[in-house]
Interface confidence: low
């Protein structure tokens, strides 16, 4: 709930945003922090054995509006969430895997597409 007198205007995007990065850290990152003119993201996807893997990092401004608004196709088993409101905001993002849709099944382990 907003406190009385608190502005309801959206927080302007910082010129340089710092994000937590995990599995998507650039070589020059320090302490698992990357910097971007765009968005922080957290993503969950399945690995080859069907286990969920969470990664996080920075998305550049160019093209990231499309990425972040683009909820993945359900059967991709991948979901990405983005934020810009403060530094390291992606620590608080918790995307969930969408359900299976039109997955190809083979004998034994699940075959991805």
């Amino acid at each position: 709930k907003k406190e009385d007198g608190e502005s309801t205007a959206p927080t302007p995007r910082p010129k340089v945003l710092r994000c937590k990065c995990h599995h998507h850290c650039p070589e020059d990152s320090v302490n698992n922090i990357c910097s971007t003119d765009g968005y922080c993201f957290t993503m969950i996807e399945e690995d080859d054995s069907g286990l969920p893997v969470v990664t996080s990092g920075c998305l550049g401004l160019e093209g990231s509006d499309f990425q972040c608004r683009d909820t993945p196709i359900p059967h991709q088993r991948r979901s990405i969430e983005c934020c810009t409101e403060r530094n390291e905001c992606n620590k608080d993002l918790h995307p969930t895997l969408p359900p299976l849709k039109n997955r190809d099944f083979v004998d034994g382990p699940i075959h991805h597409r």
């Epitope: 990231s64 196709i73 597409r113």
Partner: antibody
Framework: QVTLKESGPGILQPSQTLSLTCSFS??????????VGWIRQPSGKGLEWLAH???????SYNPALKSRLTISKDTSNNQVFLKIASVVTADTATYYC????????WGQGTLVTVSA | DIVMSQSPSSLAVSVGEKVTMSCKSS????????????LAWYQQKPGQSPKLLIY???TRESGVPDRFTGSGSGTDFTLTISSVKAEDLAVYYC?????????FGAGTKLELK
């Protein structure tokens, strides 16, 4: 600014392998979530999705053509490739590449004619 | 596979007329987790590549005139042009991006009466 451009052989004979290249700028296939797809359109007919590739090298194919299709990418050179084996005259079409899974950006298309 | 059916296959219209065209899917395109319909509409003019008009069934792509409106949910969708202009004469395709294989409708051709 996102641009995509397809290139191909123009004409080839039945039973040959069709090799297509999609060269793009303004997007990177190393960006998490990014994907590029191939769609074709025979003259005067509708659109048919062929194949898709994601930044992490996941691939998806049209089941009706899967045995003949191979999609691949060269991330560093901003290119995606499609090969169609054992072409027949019914593969004559304009071939497009496009970004994403709802296709906000398309190339201009390249016409491929399969003729003996 | 999800089958997309469009009607009518062609439509003769006069400039200034209101036009509606239909797209039906063989299964629901509504994803309950985010309440979004995974449906897009494209316009293709002769000799040109298709152009994205509408995504999420009703969201207008940037730069698309507001005379184009997408509506519907689940399996029944409609594209409406409130007042047709000569430049709107084209073929209109719907496409589902709910699951692979991605599929298109056969198109509705808009012609001058």
């Amino acid at each position: 600014q996102v641009t995509l451009k397809e290139s191909g052989p123009g004409i080839l004979q039945p039973s040959q392998t069709l090799s297509l290249t999609c060269s793009f700028s303004g997007l990177s296939l190393s960006t998490p979530g990014m994907s590029v797809g191939w769609i074709r359109q025979p003259s005067g007919k509708g659109l048919e999705w062929l194949a898709h590739i994601w930044w992490n090298d996941d691939k998806s194919y049209n089941p009706a053509l899967k045995s003949r299709l191979t999609i691949s990418k060269d991330t560093s050179n901003n290119q995606v490739f499609l090969k169609i084996a054992s072409v027949v005259t019914a593969d004559t079409a304009t071939y497009y590449c496009a970004r994403g899974d709802r296709f906000a950006y398309w190339g201009q298309g390249t016409l491929v004619t399969v003729s003996a | 596979d999800i089958v997309m059916s469009q009607s009518p296959s062609s439509l003769a219209v006069s400039v200034g007329e209101k036009v509606t065209m239909s797209c039906k899917s063989s299964q629901s395109l509504l994803y309950s987790n985010n309440q979004k319909n995974y449906l897009a509409w494209y316009q293709q003019k002769p000799g040109q590549s298709p152009k994205l008009l509408i995504y999420w069934a009703s969201t207008r792509e940037s730069g698309v005139p507001d005379r184009f409106t997408g509506s519907g949910s689940g399996t029944d969708f409609t594209l409406t042009i409130s007042s047709v202009k000569a430049e709107d004469l084209a073929v209109y395709y719907c496409q589902q991006y709910y699951s692979f294989p991605l599929t298109f409708g056969a198109g509705t051709k808009l012609e001058l009466k």
